[in-house]
Interface confidence: low
Amino acid sequence: DAHKSEVAHRFKDLGEENFKALVLIAFAQYLQQCPFEDHVKLVNEVTEFAKTCVADESAENCDKSLHTLFGDKLCTVATLRETYGEMADCCAKQEPERNECFLQHKDDNPNLPRLVRPEVDVMCTAFHDNEETFLKKYLYEIARRHPYFYAPELLFFAKRYKAAFTECCQAADKAACLLPKLDELRDEGKASSAKQRLKCASLQKFGERAFKAWAVARLSQRFPKAEFAEVSKLVTDLTKVHTECCHGDLLECADDRADLAKYICENQDSISSKLKECCEKPLLEKSHCIAEVENDEMPADLPSLAADFVESKDVCKNYAEAKDVFLGMFLYEYARRHPDYSVVLLLRLAKTYETTLEKCCAAADPHECYAKVFDEFKPLVEEPQNLIKQNCELFEQLGEYKFQNALLVRYTKKVPQVSTPTLVEVSRNLGKVGSKCCKHPEAKRMPCAEDYLSVVLNQLCVLHEKTPVSDRVTKCCTESLVNRRPCFSALEVDETYVPKEFNAETFTFHADICTLSEKERQIKKQTALVELVKHKPKATKEQLKAVMDDFAAFVEKCCKADDKETCFAEEGKKLVAASQAALGL
């Protein structure tokens, strides 16, 4: 399937609009600090070049790889060294090393200003004045802040973003129409970014085999009526799509994702009965819908797994003959029978099964050795079940904010070296598992909770990797992808930690807190809570609760005062003194 000109091939497959959008995303994800106008200029130059190649595939440079073309274009940026420092050294390398170099410099936490939402009228004016620029700016701002965002899915978000403005800027109450839609897109976008970041981490840190195992388990749960060979084909294709997107090959990724959606819809009879509605939608909606589709019903009367994977005398022969295929079948058969298990649990079970076969197939009596392998699964299944039960009970008792606070304290004591903003962000997200998953019936709780926690803990891992400060975090993040959550759960208070020096400035607040949104105010309080624990890691729950209650009362009192700033200054000193006394600082 070779093409004389790869850039012409992708331009024709994707169409000009998607081509330009994807090139913009790719460039913004690589050069995250470059101004919008510079990126637009680069994209226009690439697009004009692509058009010449469409007209004549034999034209000069049209035979070059996309990495070569895009890399050459990025390396024309004049301020590369001043803005990006050592990333400029990438430009001295040849492909494929140059692209690998760019990938390594992607920054999960770029030093960019927070996106402030303008007034609705201002946004609507900007949208009507130049719709194309307005939407490009959205792609640019999201892509540069989320350098691993799944590019074809970002096109879907942009389509919804456009639809929201098209509808709401004509509405009688623009704000009432638009703001909830923008909030929803923001929250869904953050979740989508985090989910994709885990896929890329899985591929980049643990390899294709780890990603394929994840995909076999997830697709087998989702499509339990599909044949193993069908699931295997989907896994192979899906792995290619995500490898491309995680590797910065966004045009190929979007093109292959469209092909995969087409294949799934053409073959839905042998895949799942739940795809009909998805397959009637336009391309971007269709792909999104397939990715989120509910699990199909399990086939009736599935035979016991034990016959093929334990009782059979040929287990070792089958395993030796094609290890990964045999383990893939085990994972497929187990996952399709267990939509109630998290993917990471299924992968732990498969790993246990693999380890047992490795040991037993070399033993004198293999069958005797592996006969009880399924008994080893019981504690692995019960551990997440019990953890979820306990935490959902705590969530129901405390509510989301206080549940987040409990997790903040728990995780700050486990890994106090981690930066306060990271601990706040991660613990807040961990705490959201309650409202997201605890409402579900038992059968849906574990896949919801544990797989969500995998996504959140990956955020901790990628943020920590940028500036490693804790050996414990490094250990949990790198040893095993599927055991990250149990590894963090098992961490106790870090007894080696030397408490942080007390700094009154950390606990000094001003009247500006009164004008913050409820969410921002919570973050301020939670930041203070983390700092308290870092100063006094042995503080009891009761002590911390008392200080936090005093703090909440102090904020409420001063925000009602006539002279707010004076109140914050005077009452703040008293609060700090009282807190120090209460905690014995």
């Epitope: 009526k225 044949e227 193993f228 060979a229 069908e230 295997s232 084909k233 086939p299 599935l302 035979p303 093929d308 059979s312 040929d314 022969k317 089958n318 003959e321 094609a322 295929v325 079948m329 058969e333």
Partner: nanobody, 115 residues
Framework: EVQLVESGGGLVQSGGSLRLSCAAS????????MSWVRQAPGKGPEWVSA????????RYAESVKGRFTISRDNAKKTLYLQMNSLKPEDTAVYYC????????GSQGTQVTVSS
Amino acid sequence: EVQLVESGGGLVQSGGSLRLSCAASGFTFGSFGMSWVRQAPGKGPEWVSAVDSGGADTRYAESVKGRFTISRDNAKKTLYLQMNSLKPEDTAVYYCTIGQSTTRGSQGTQVTVSS
């Protein structure tokens, strides 16, 4: 598209023979072990026989041992089941499946053995 199409079934007298074929397409046939499974009216699926990806290693259910022979031709992407000394209790829909699954992925071919 992954497809498995069985043929060769039919009506045969007790003690007679039939040769079933399964033509595979849409996946790397030579990389997978294959099985024959049958389902008698009103009963659950029963595993009959399996062959490894290369064709060297074969396995049979006790009920068919010595009478049935499984084989494959990877070049033709086809799986076979030679059935001799057929008995009325062999009457069922026979279908081929990938690996050791006893899940129907195809339509199957009807084998009826009359006494």
